[in-house]
Amino acid sequence: CKAMHVAQPAVVLASSRGIASFVCEYASPGKATEVRVTVLRQADSQVTEVCAATYMMGNELTFLDDSICTGTSSGNQVNLTIQGLRAMDTGLYICKVELMYPPPYYLGIGNGTQIYVIDPEPCPDSDF
């Protein structure tokens, strides 16, 4: 069967510092040496790219310097962390995996992780 299944958690709650982490795992139908992982955000019918990284199997996952994402890879599993999240960023975050090399190319798209972000309450002023 020429299919690549991608699994990710259904729901994640971001920390009070606006950081959310989740695992994206894929069942590879081929022996890929180069893999691309993209995080997409779907809000209503709009889809935007949050971040993307290409990595060689066995090497570390490297996002661009200005990316809000960081991650590590281990086999067919990618641990993703998204930083700087605010309440308005609450939404469905979809993990997309592409086996880029060698051919054939394979595409796998997860069902998405609903990330909930709650802005922290400002600390009340203290009188001493």
């Epitope: 069967c1 299919a3 180069e34 691309r36 997309k96 090399y101 595409l107």
Partner: antibody
């Protein structure tokens, strides 16, 4: 608005070469895989080639391997198809098409006609 | 290579009728799209992921199916729906299209 505009088609003799261009506008070109799809007169659609993101990874249909080369210039938002050793069976309308984030081809150019004839 | 076979080759229907188009794959397909093409025009994406409507596509178009059997349904044909429809698999290379189904006015 988001659009793709092809150019470079024409009439060429068998064995000769032609280069097609596809200029993209209205979106972040480097974030998408780009494809060439062709349609022979009165026939169906045939995928020809794809090039990914930074241009390092490319795939071709078997019938054009070794003859056609897909490339892109992200600084110019332009996709290319260099066609060498052209054959009569390469006669078709050539479309460039963007692969949506979810993989399907959501934006297509208007097409450019390539006729290979002596 | 995954071979997609569409049926019927031609569908003769009247406006207002329901159209059911089939696409069968030679092996299991993970991602399938449907396109509409009118004479002299580029194809237009209708459905992706077997059942998700593309932006701006009317809800009379719906897709269903999984594995090797997929269906495009047009609930009530409008005059502008008479065209050729193609299915495509895009889960693995090489990307392949079906041979097309022509929906014509009866």
């Amino acid at each position: 608005q988001v659009q793709l505009v092809e150019s470079g088609g024409g009439v060429v003799q068998p064995g000769r070469s032609l280069r097609l261009s596809c200029e993209a506008s209205g979106f972040t070109f480097s974030s998408y895989g780009m494809n060439w799809v062709r349609q022979a007169p009165g026939k169906g659609l045939e995928w020809v080639a794809v090039i990914w993101y930074d241009g390092r990874n490319k795939h071709y249909t078997d019938s054009v391997k070794g003859r056609f080369t897909i490339s892109r210039d992200n600084s110019k938002n332009t996709l290319y198809l260099q066609m060498n050793s052209l054959r009569a069976e390469d006669t078709a309308v050539y479309y460039c098409a963007r692969a949506h984030y979810f993989g399907a081809f959501d934006i297509w150019g208007q097409g450019t006609m390539v006729t290979v004839s002596s | 290579e995954i071979v997609l076979t569409q049926s019927p080759g031609t569908l003769s229907l009247s406006p207002g009728e329901r159209a059911t188009l089939s696409c069968r794959a030679s092996q299991s397909v993970s991602y399938l799209a449907w396109y509409q093409q009118k004479p002299g025009q580029a194809p237009r994406l209708l459905i992706y992921g077997a059942s998700s409507r593309a932006t701006g596509i009317p809800d009379r178009f719906s897709g269903s199916g999984s594995g090797t059997d997929f269906t495009l349904t047009i609930s009530r044909l409008e005059p502008e729906d008479f065209a050729v429809y193609y299915c495509q698999q895009y889960g693995s290379s090489p990307w392949t299209f079906g041979q097309g189904t022509k929906v014509e006015i009866k």
